[in-house]
């Protein structure tokens, strides 16, 4: 009489999370009479998955009707598979008894669960960084299996190379997580730029998942300042203009100082956006030259996005000669640049000599 064999034909089975897994098992003989049980794992700590004889196993059903006469097929179907179901499953034949006695085990079938990675979440720096600096973006995705996964970074469609990626845990697990950091050099043209984290996995059928971050949330583009004087008006008033250009974000405060004293403070609001996402703002100050004996030092002081103030000064030279009503008055205007300790780039300092 041939010895009973417990046959598990598949060494491994791979199933997508949410699907059902069929684990096949047949026995080679009706003899001896006794039940089949399914276990996950081997040894004393093994977990009972299905017992044909008794117990309640809501997710497990027998593939063949166990009441079928001469049944030798003890395959099972496990529904709604999750990564936690991964492991090696053993079909074990018992001999009828009180209690039933374990007789023989199948070779085991390893169930691996293909679980999709979660949507990648990209996060940027906690505080803005100035253009021409490098910042780090992180991308995280969780819950995938198997472990093999590909992650790429792009900035405006161009793949980034300064990237460090880790998949955890390093050993065997029911599911895995990936975390990647990309270092991105910010430029003044990056207000409208975007970084994309792209994750490719066997479960995604060639349609990678993407997470994005807008550099507008990470970048600060400092303003250029230029102070200029318009022609003196007939009423001895000089119109001095402070042009603040190419800055981002919009949060900006401008203060005019006359000989060091605050003349006016303004806050930028509702400015039109340049094509590149930056903003421009122009402020002017009318200076009554006849009210001054000495030269007037005008300073345009700009505080942008909470950074140290940047100053641009301009001297209005008041002529020593008496002015005639309605005639041009000569005034020498000298522009100088004064700055606080900041990393802002500015136009070259300029000295303007205007003769009217």
């Amino acid at each position: 009489e041939e010895e009973l064999q417990v046959i598990q034909p598949e060494k491994s089975v791979s199933v997508a999370a949410g699907d059902s897994a069929t684990l096949n098992c047949t026995v080679s003989s009706l003899i001896p009479v006794g039940p089949i049980q399914w276990f996950r794992g081997a040894g004393p700590g093994r977990e009972l998955i299905y017992n044909l004889k008794e117990g309640h196993f809501p997710r497990v059903t027998a593939v063949s009707d166990p009441t079928k006469r001469n049944n030798m097929d003890f395959s099972i179907r496990i529904s709604n598979i999750t990564p936690a179901d991964a492991g090696t499953y053993y079909c074990v034949k018992f001999r009828k008894g009180s209690p039933d006695v374990e007789l023989k085990s199948g070779a085991g079938t390893e169930l691996s669960v293909r679980a999709k990675p979660s949507a990648p979440v990209v996060s940027g720096p906690a505080v803005r960084a100035t253009a021409e600096h490098t910042v780090s973006f992180t991308c995280e995705s969780h819950g995938f299996s198997p472990r093999d996964i590909t992650l790429k970074w792009f900035k405006n469609g161009n793949e980034l190379s300064d990237v460090q990626t880790n998949v955890d845990p390093a050993g065997k697990s029911v599911s895995y997580s990936i975390r990647s950091t990309a270092r991105v050099l910010l430029t003044r043209r990056d207000v409208h730029s975007q970084v994309i984290c792209e994750v490719a996995h066997v479960t995604l059928q060639g349609d990678p998942l993407r997470g994005t971050a807008n550099l507008s949330e990470a970048i600060r583009v400092p303003p250029f300042l230029e102070v200029t004087q318009q022609s003196m008006r007939a009423d001895n008033q000089v119109n001095v203009t402070c042009q603040v250009t190419k800055f981002y974000p919009q949060r900006l405060q401008l203060t005019w100082l006359e000989n060091g004293n605050v003349s006016r403070t303004e806050m930028a609001s509702a400015l039109p956006e340049n094509k590149d996402g930056t903003y421009n703002w122009t402020s002017w100050l009318l200076v009554n030259v006849s009210a001054h004996r000495d030269d007037v030092k005008l300073t345009c002081q700009v505080e942008h996005d909470g950074q140290p103030a940047v100053n641009k000064s301009f001297s209005v030279k008041v002529s020593a000669h008496p002015k005639e009503q309605g005639s041009n008055t000569a005034a020498e205007n000298t522009g100088t640049n004064e700055r606080g300790s900041s990393d802002y780039k500015d136009d070259d300092d300029k000295h303007h000599h205007h003769h009217h």
């Epitope: 003899i31 009479v33 006794g34 008794e54």
Partner: antibody, heavy 119, light 110 residues
Framework: QVQLVQSGAEVKKPGASVKVSCKAS????????INWVRQAPGQGLEWIAM????????HYNQIFKDRATLTTDTSTSTAYMELRSLRSDDTAVYYC????????????WGRGTLVTVSS | DIVLTQSPDSLAVSLGERATINCRAS??????????IFWYQQKPGQPPKLLIY???NLDSGVPDRFSGSGSGTDFTLTISSLQAEDVAVYYC????????FGQGTKLEIK
Amino acid sequence: QVQLVQSGAEVKKPGASVKVSCKASGYTFTNYWINWVRQAPGQGLEWIAMIDPSDSETHYNQIFKDRATLTTDTSTSTAYMELRSLRSDDTAVYYCAMDYGSLYAMDYWGRGTLVTVSS
Amino acid sequence: DIVLTQSPDSLAVSLGERATINCRASKSVSSSGYNYIFWYQQKPGQPPKLLIYLASNLDSGVPDRFSGSGSGTDFTLTISSLQAEDVAVYYCQESWELPTFGQGTKLEIK
């Protein structure tokens, strides 16, 4: 431990019906056939019928096909055998038995229910 | 229907001696290497107890002095050394078709 507990003895008049119950425990009721067998006093074993509790599929001995009805209540793991139009020669011990090997055999038996048919 | 005929109807054997009971089917009950014959023991006032399944396989807890053999239409239950507790009625049953029982063999001590 598999157990089949049957209902108590019955005395019936000819022409009446009897319904014997068999409550199963110690195993998954829907995974195994239940057989009904009777034994008249001093006589041999006579197979009546069998039922699959999972889907109520039944097989009857032709002798009993018109008079016996097998049912189950899976919520209580109980099998029933009703025998109608009783005659005096239906006096017997009625056994339920479970087929553990799906071989149409009887591995575990209840203790039996004596049904006496007498006018 | 298959008819099972047991012989003898009754049998008296001395303690420690061999007892043999035969069962003949009206047609073959064998296929694919399996013989669909079962043997039961019934003691007075008790339900039957399965002894042997598929002609030659001892059920759980059955002493090994019991054995079964045969194929096709002829089958035998043997008790190699009769014990006092073996006094009972023995039945064969086939499951080639729907179950039927033999008429029984009463075993007594000589």
